[in-house]
C-alpha cells in the first residue's frame, strides 16, 4: 500500500524537514531557513515562532521543530505553549491593570504571581489561630480551644485538607 | 494542509455588533495564534487581533474597546465580534494563522465582505 | 505603533523584466536575534494576501526562487528579478516586531 501511494503521490515520500516543492517537480526541498515541517508529506513547512519582545527562547527552532518560549526575568508565562507574558509582582502583591498593589488586609500571596487569597478561617475547623497571618503568609491554625483545657487528650485528629483554592499552585 | 473560511452574515446594521466565525481544517486549531484582518475596499490591510489557542487575546489599540476575539477548540473554530459597528467598518474580514503572535500570516481564509449599512 | 512607507505605488512593468519595490519603516525592525522582523504579501486580484517573504529574506517555501527580499532596519527591498504574468497584484510590506502589526500601502504591480 505504501508502494501505491508513493506513486499517486510524490509528496508522501517527502520526510520531516522537508517539504514537496511544486516549483521543482514535487521534488523534496529543505525547509527554508527559520521554517519547519514536524511531520512527511507537507507541502508547505511551517514558519517558526519568533520569541521577541517580553519572550526569550527556550528551544531554539529545528527543520523538524518549532521554536519554544519563556518569559525575560521579571515576567513569568501564561497560557499553554506560554502564548502571554505576565509581570511578576512581589510576594505579598498581585497584579491589577494599574500594576502591583499590597494585598488587602484579610489575605495573602506567597508567590511572584496570582491574586491575593483570604487566610484560612482556622474557626471554620474549630480550630485556633496559631500564627497570624501576614500579606505573604496565610495564617497557621493550632488546636482548637478544648483541645488546650487541662485534662484533654493529647492526640489530635488530623487535620482536614485544605480547600483547592489555598493549596500552592 | 491547513485552510481556513470564514462565515457570517454579511449585512450588520448601524451600531449592531458585527460576528464572525473562521473555521480550521486540515490541522488543530490547538497550536499558533489566529488573527483577524480586514481591508475596506479599494484600501490596505489592518491586523485587529489574535487569539492563542489556550484563550489569551491581543487586540489592535485602535479597535480594543468594540473588538472581543474568542476561541472553541472542541469545533476547531475561532470568532470576531465587533460591536457599535459604522460604515467604516465596511471591510472583507480575513481570518489568518498567525505564527508568531503578530507575524508572518502563513494561511488566510478567503475573506468574506461584511456591509454596514441600514 | 509604526508607520510603513511603501514606494512607488503603482509599478508597470514589461513581462521578463525586473521590478523593485521599497519599503521603509518608522522605527528599526532589526531585533536583538539578529532577525529583520518584516513580511512581504502579494495580494491578487480577488484573492486574498499570500507571504511571499519572511524576517526580511527569507523565501517562504513554495514561492518561486525570482523573488527576493533584501535591507536592514528600516530600509527594505523586494526584488523579483523577471516579472511574469502572474505576479500582477499588490503587494504589501508588514512590520512584525511590534503589535500590532502595521501593513504599508501597498504597490500595485501591472503589465505593461
Known amino acids: 500500500f505504501e508502494r501505491t501511494r508513493s506513486l499517486q503521490d510524490p509528496c508522501s515520500n517527502c520526510p520531516a524537514g522537508t517539504f514537496c516543492d511544486n516549483n521543482r517537480n514535487q521534488i523534496c526541498s529543505p525547509c527554508p531557513p527559520n521554517s519547519f515541517s514536524s511531520a512527511g508529506g507537507q507541502r508547505t513547512c511551517d514558519i517558526c515562532r519568533q520569541c521577541k519582545g517580553v519572550f526569550r527562547t527556550r528551544k531554539e527552532c529545528s527543520s523538524t521543530s518549532n521554536a519554544e518560549c519563556d518569559c525575560t526575568p521579571g515576567f513569568h508565562c501564561l497560557g499553554a505553549g506560554c502564548s502571554m507574558c505576565e509581570q511578576d509582582c512581589k510576594q505579598g502583591q498581585e497584579l491589577t491593570k494599574k500594576g502591583c498593589k499590597d494585598c488587602c488586609f484579610g489575605t495573602f500571596n506567597d508567590q511572584k504571581r496570582g491574586i491575593c487569597r483570604p487566610w484560612t478561617n482556622c474557626s471554620l475547623d474549630g480550630k485556633s489561630v496559631l500564627v497570624n497571618g501576614t500579606k505573604e503568609r496565610d495564617v497557621v491554625c493550632g488546636p482548637s480551644p478544648a483541645d488546650l483545657s487541662p485534662g484533654a487528650s493529647s492526640v489530635t485528629p488530623p487535620a482536614p485538607a485544605r480547600e483547592p483554592g489555598h493549596s500552592p499552585q | 494542509q491547513v485552510q481556513l473560511q470564514e462565515s457570517g452574515p454579511g449585512l450588520v446594521k448601524p451600531s449592531e455588533t458585527l460576528s464572525l466565525t473562521c473555521t480550521v481544517s486540515g490541522g488543530s486549531i490547538s497550536s499558533y495564534y489566529w488573527s483577524w484582518i480586514r481591508q475596506p475596499p479599494g484600501k490596505g490591510l489592518e491586523w485587529m487581533g489574535y487569539?492563542?489557542?489556550?484563550?489569551?487575546?491581543q487586540y489592535n489599540p485602535s479597535l480594543k474597546s468594540r473588538v472581543t476575539i474568542s476561541v472553541d477548540t472542541s469545533k476547531n473554530q475561532f470568532s470576531l465580534k465587533l460591536s457599535s459597528v459604522t460604515a467604516a467598518d465596511t471591510a472583507v474580514y480575513y481570518c489568518?494563522?498567525?505564527?508568531?503572535?503578530?507575524?508572518?500570516?502563513?494561511?488566510w481564509g478567503q475573506g468574506t465582505l461584511v456591509t454596514v449599512s441600514s | 505603533e509604526i508607520v510603513m512607507t511603501q514606494s512607488p505605488l503603482s509599478l508597470p512593468v514589461t513581462p521578463g523584466e525586473p521590478a523593485s519595490i521599497s519599503c521603509r519603516s518608522s522605527?528599526?525592525?532589526?531585533?536583538?536575534?539578529?532577525?529583520?522582523?518584516l513580511d512581504w504579501y502579494l495580494q491578487k486580484p480577488g484573492q486574498s494576501p499570500q507571504l511571499l517573504i519572511y524576517l526580511g529574506s527569507n523565501r517562504a517555501s513554495g514561492v518561486p526562487d525570482r523573488f527576493s527580499g533584501s535591507g536592514s532596519g528600516t530600509d527594505f527591498t523586494l526584488k523579483i528579478s523577471r516579472v511574469e504574468a502572474e505576479d500582477v497584484g499588490v503587494y504589501y510590506c508588514?512590520?512584525?516586531?511590534?503589535?500590532?502589526?502595521?501593513f504599508g500601502q501597498g504597490t500595485k504591480l501591472e503589465i505593461k
Open positions: 522605527q528599526s525592525l532589526l531585533y536583538s536575534n539578529g532577525y529583520n522582523h
Open positions: 487569539i492563542y489557542y489556550s484563550g489569551s487575546t
Open positions: 508588514m512590520q512584525a516586531l511590534q503589535t500590532p502589526p502595521t
Open positions: 489568518a494563522r498567525d505564527q508568531s503572535g503578530g507575524g508572518s500570516f502563513q494561511h
